[in-house]
Amino acid sequence: AVNGTSRFTCFYNSRANISCVWSQDGALQDTSCQVHAWPDRRRWNQTCELLPVSQASWACNLILGTPDSQKLTAVDIVTLRVMCREGVRWRMMAIQDFKPFENLRLMAPISLQVVHVETHRCNISWKISQASHYFERHLEFEARTLSPGHTWEEAPLMTLKQKQEWICLETLTPDTQYEFQVRVKPLQGEFTTWSPWSQPLAFRTKPAALGKD
């Protein structure tokens, strides 16, 4: 779109996936587009088909290998190109020199579980998924708890400024249903962003003992 606005945003999950979104004002929904990935120092290249996710937005995942394989490093540069079909030919729409470890978004944490629950507190643990060993302990987390009668957006954020894959929630109300979510972010990368929120974990605090506050 010469006078419209387009946007090409990609993130590396730190292992073997680059997820991309291409949006363009005024583009037709049935436009056929692809993302081509050409690393500067690897023998492989990869392509994915952009599929519509909204009115003028398309997304795809460049699968670089098995989920836990380390396909890129901090010194790699991957040239990403958006190509769209115009009649019988392919037209280059956008190009980005992509630095994977400057554009990180990890997978959502998984395996959330209640380790221990009491009347006023609950200990929860989780695991990170497909995260590079390069980070060592240089990760941070945000967590939030959904209380009855509130929305996720109203839930205060709890920040864990270290690689700590558990939390002890306190000052909870007895015999009450809650939900819990967590997300992760590496400390590295100028354009790095938070992972998606984990699937919510539902739990219930224990009822207060009879005859006690």
Epitope: A1, V2, N3, G4, T5, S6, R7, F8, D40, I77, T79, R81, M93, A94, I95, Q96, D97, F98, E190, F191
Partner: nanobody, 123 residues
Amino acid sequence: EVQLVESGGGLVQAGGSLRLSCAASGRAIENYPVGWFRQAPGKEREFVAAITWISGSTLYADSVKGRFTISRDNAKNTVYLQMSSLKPEDTALYYCAAALKTITRGQNDYSYWGQGTQVTVSS
């Protein structure tokens, strides 16, 4: 914040050549690839060419493909537009612009603009 300064414009005869320069400055300039645009009197600004700093990947407008070449010198943080086989219809004010990470043909995708340098092609 990215600053861009164009130079090299002038008066040239049809069929002649000219090289425009765009000097870029600012923090982490490699994150801001550069494009050239032009605006003729009474016309809308149009895309000419663009280049990324790291790989040197390029995009061109169909109207200049084969006549204009965009290049960059990373050591000097400068992008060049070599224009040859110039035509009177290439007469315009030529701007360089910088975009965050991605080059496209859309002027709205470029956040930083120079003041422009005038190119006049006489017949």
